[in-house]
């Protein structure tokens, strides 16, 4: 209708990075920019994804290098983390959130794809990491190895081999395991502290240089107490599981101190593994009963999990696997290991700014049934799996509903702000829920809408529209872009209108009647008034139309509803040659060229396109007859 198609600004970017996957208009004290997501962008050797800021009128885009943002104290994997897959602007302070839903971190032998987002302030400076699903690894452990280095240990090289082999089993790194080693005999020394080395390679290298210090006495209690009171303090981390591994070959010369030492270790929640090396006893034919009892006393209960004995130093190699497995069985404590909570949640797959924080869709949460998490300045709200059961019953738990594929919110005069989330795979047809979140991790689900067609992906895109600008939502639009009709993936956008407290179905938006795939409804944007009639409008993307070139449809708002016939259809081919997937993302909230009219930003594969609004001239004709 009044969008200019002759002089668009086509901002080029990398197709392989999928520059244009997301677009947001941005205002910094009067300067207008486009923020463009490129979720497959490369940073160094890693395909991290990134976000660009692009000047509106002319000039080149600048990469914000958010892909370089690192989280301390985790062993992160940023490759393929899809930074920029979702963008959410906060109009209050012009900050925005850029999410990396496939950001993952190493936990033991697993990679947990919890996702994370970066908050960027209004002048494009990174300000904060938002990662509500990130939990401490079960391998967040401080392990201190207490080595008997007294004269009777022989040959030392076997102890060294054992040490190196067990260290190679440990998941050493930020947010995971730290290892310290103390050696004792008559005295105790730090061989290295917990925070001296941050990789298996470095720890193994250090361990290979530990020499036997000797000593005529074996002060095991002293060694344990030294480890508890000093080794766990120097470089120890708050909240880390404390694990001690004691390796000795004889009764201690200070066994009367063991009671107090073990009591203090218990008080400090130190889990103790104890290894009795019987070489000295066997070489001399001595009964080891008293020694074994002492080592069992040192080991945490139950003995069958924490106590080991080997015939001699050379046999230490035989317990490496068992000891490693026992230590890492701590990982699974009180957990049903066949089930995922937030470990694979992919938080930030979608994002939406609300008054007190941000809503983040987490499609992989709870075994890919999905969830919506909320991060606020006061903390995070992570609803429990059970809170979704009303609409996502237990019998469908293995279906992978993908709740959180998209998130938004509506405002009703009765209930205030209500959150909305889509689950496009629910029971194969898709579902949308409207809910409020509570600080006790429960939800109140007010309403649910179901998709009609299997595989239509109903709920993969949702937009709320306040047509008349009174602060109350008038219309909720739900996309089902894979809706199959007349032999093609045509797509459908459902219209729901707010009546009192409920959204009532009121038909669908009309697309063009072409005979190709379109995926109409892949993106739906509520935009400010484009045609200057004082009603806010809607733009719908159909990125597969015209043989994947793409198109957008403009629908005008009118008197608290939306006109279901498009007022303008803009195809990529009208604007520039070679555009593909035009309409995959849309944003229209700002006047970008200072002409008093709202302009549109549209994403495509490798491009961001700005469409300028033209003024609408209203001609009122009046006819006068003379003589009357």
């Amino acid at each position: 209708f009044n969008m200019d198609t002759r002089k668009p600004r086509v901002i080029p970017g990398s197709r392989t990075a999928f520059f244009g996957y997301t677009v947001q208009q941005h205002d910094i004290s009067g300067n207008k920019w486009l923020v463009v997501g490129a979720p497959l962008e490369t940073n160094g050797y890693q395909k991290t994804g990134d976000v660009y800021k692009c000047p509106v009128i002319h000039g080149n885009c600048t990469k914000l290098n958010l892909g370089r943002v690192t989280l301390s104290n985790v062993s992160e994997r940023k490759d393929n983390m899809r930074l920029g897959l979702s963008l959410a602007t906060n109009p209050k302070d012009n900050s925005f959130l850029a999410c990396s839903p496939l950001w993952s971190h190493e936990c033991g032998s697993s990679y947990y794809t919890t996702g994370m987002c970066s908050r960027v302030n209004s002048n494009f400076r990174f300000s904060k990491t938002v990662a509500p699903a990130l939990q401490r690894c079960q391998t967040y452990m401080d392990i201190v190895i207490v080595l008997d280095g007294s004269n009777s240990i022989y040959p030392w090289v076997e102890v060294q081999h054992f040490l190196i082999n067990i260290l190679k089993k440990f998941y050493i790194g930020p947010g995971q395991i730290q290892v310290g080693v103390v050696q004792y005999g008559e005295d105790v020394v730090h061989e290295f502290h917990l925070n001296d080395y941050r990789s298996v390679k470095d720890v193994v290298e250090a361990a290979s240089h530990i020499e036997q210090r000797g000593g005529t006495e074996t002060r095991t209690a002293f060694g344990i107490e030294f480890a508890r009171s000093e080794a766990f303090q120097k470089g120890g981390r708050k909240g880390a599981k404390k694990v001690m591994i004691v390796i000795t070959d004889g009764e201690s010369h200070d066994s009367p101190d063991l009671e107090k030492v073990i009591q203090q270790s218990e008080r400090d929640n130190v889990t103790r593994y104890a290894v009795a090396v019987l070489g000295y006893y066997n070489r001399r034919g001595i009964n080891p009963e008293t020694f074994l009892n002492e080592i069992k006393y040192i080991a945490s209960d139950p003995d069958d999990k924490h106590f080991f004995n080997v015939t001699d130093e050379a046999a230490l190699k035989d317990i490496v696997d068992a000891l490693g497995d026992r230590i890492f069985s701590l990982e699974g404590t009180n957990k049903n290991e066949t089930s995922f909570g937030l470990e694979m949640s992919q938080t930030g797959f979608s994002s939406h700014v609300v008054e007190d924080g941000v809503l983040l869709g987490a499609v992989g949460a709870y075994d890919w049934n999905g969830a919506v998490l909320k991060e606020t300045s006061a903390g995070k709200v992570i609803p429990l799996r059970e809170s979704y059961l009303k609409e996502f019953p237990e019998e469908l738990k293995n279906h992978g509903a993908y709740l959180g594929y998209t998130v938004t919110s509506v405002v009703s005069s009765r209930q205030g702000r209500v959150y909305v989330a889509g689950a496009p795979r629910f029971n194969h047809t898709g579902k949308v829920i409207l809910f409020t979140m509570h600080n006790n991790r429960s939800l109140t689900i007010h309403q649910a809408m179901r998709g009609q067609q299997i595989g239509s992906y109903f709920g993969s895109e949702i937009t709320s529209v306040d047509i008349d600008g009174d602060g109350v939502t008038d219309v909720l639009l739900v996309g089902a872009p894979m809706y199959f009709n007349e032999g093609r993936e045509r797509g459908k956008v459902y219209v729901y209108e707010l009546r009192q407290n409920l959204f009532v179905y009121n038909g669908t938006l009309k697309d063009s009647h072409s005979y190709q795939n379109a995926r109409f409804g892949s993106s739906i944007a509520s935009v400010r008034d484009l045609n200057q009639d004082s009603y806010n409008d809607v733009v719908v993307g159909a990125p597969l139309e015209d043989n994947h070139a793409g198109a957008i449809y403009i629908f005008h708002g009118f008197r608290g509803s939306i006109l279901k016939t498009p007022k303008q259809r803009i195809t990529a081919s009208e604007l520039a040659t070679g555009l593909q997937y035009f309409g995959c993302s849309i944003h229209g909230q700002l006047d970008l060229n200072e002409d008093g009219l709202i302009d549109l930003a549209v994403g495509a594969l490798g491009n961001a396109v700005i469409l300028w609004s033209r003024p609408v001239v209203q001609i009122n004709a009046s006819l006068h007859f003379e003589p009357s």
Partner: antibody
Framework: EVQLVESGGGLVQPGGSLRLSCAAS????????IHWVRQAPGKGLEWVAS????????YYADSVKGRFTISADTSKNTAYLQMNSLRAEDTAVYYC?????????????WGQGTLVTVSS | DIQMTQSPSSLSASVGDRVTITCRAS??????VAWYQQKPGKAPKLLIY???SLDSGVPSRFSGSRSGTDFTLTISSLQPEDFATYYC???????????FGQGTKVEIK
């Protein structure tokens, strides 16, 4: 030759204090534990307290807890028993004895004893 | 706390007699039980450690044994210098708390 010599005993009034010393020679106090054992006139042996000289862990009999303090100075190779709030029933000969790994946790050497009399 | 009940509290015997003194622990204990001999006006002297091991310099007529929670000191052939008071002592495992029996006085018949 291993020797333990107690000193510091004497007559004291009820409520008074006394400090006993146990000077060790012929071995390193650092490698052993020192126990104090007492024997009231005509009675049996009663264990009083013990100390690990290098870890400074201490144990006390219930009858003296809170009143007696055992300590050791490894540089002087001497152990001490500080006795406060003394009572008539604390009257006894006080022995110090060595306790260590090499005697399989038995008291293998004893001092000659020092007499403490608590009387008004 | 573990109690050591020693019996008899006294006994009369002649030179050459076989004498047996018993200590019963109130609960199961380790073998860290020792026996001491004390003569009037003297400090106690270690005879047996670890329930059955003879301390150096102690005559072989002294022996110790264990049966469950019962510990026994035996003097196979009583000599004149053996008339004294005998004490058993138990060490609590992994602490330096010790307990003495009440003592057994061996007198000349």
């Amino acid at each position: 030759e291993v020797q333990l010599v107690e000193s510091g005993g004497g007559l004291v009034q009820p409520g008074g204090s006394l400090r006993l010393s146990c000077a060790a020679s012929g071995f390193n106090l650092y490698s052993s534990y020192i126990h104090w054992v007492r024997q009231a006139p005509g009675k049996g042996l009663e264990w009083v307290a013990s100390i690990s000289s290098y870890s400074s862990y201490t144990y006390y009999a219930d009858s003296v807890k809170g009143r007696f303090t055992i300590s050791a100075d490894t540089s002087k190779n001497t152990a001490y028993l500080q006795m406060n709030s003394l009572r008539a029933e604390d009257t006894a000969v006080y022995y110090c004895a060595r306790y260590w790994y090499y005697s399989a946790w038995a008291l293998d050497y004893w001092g000659q004893g020092t007499l403490v009399t608590v009387s008004s | 706390d573990i109690q050591m009940t020693q019996s008899p509290s006294s006994l009369s015997a002649s030179v050459g007699d076989r004498v047996t003194i018993t200590c019963r622990a109130s609960q199961s204990v380790s073998s860290a039980v020792a026996w001491y001999q004390q003569k009037p006006g003297k400090a106690p002297k270690l005879l047996i450690y670890s329930a059955s091991s003879l301390d150096s310099g102690v005559p072989s007529r002294f022996s110790g044994s264990r049966s469950g929670t019962d510990f026994t000191l035996t003097i196979s052939s009583l000599q004149p210098e053996d008339f004294a008071t005998y004490y058993c002592q138990q060490s609590a495992p992994y602490s330096s708390l010790i307990t003495f029996g009440q003592g057994t006085k061996v007198e000349i018949k």
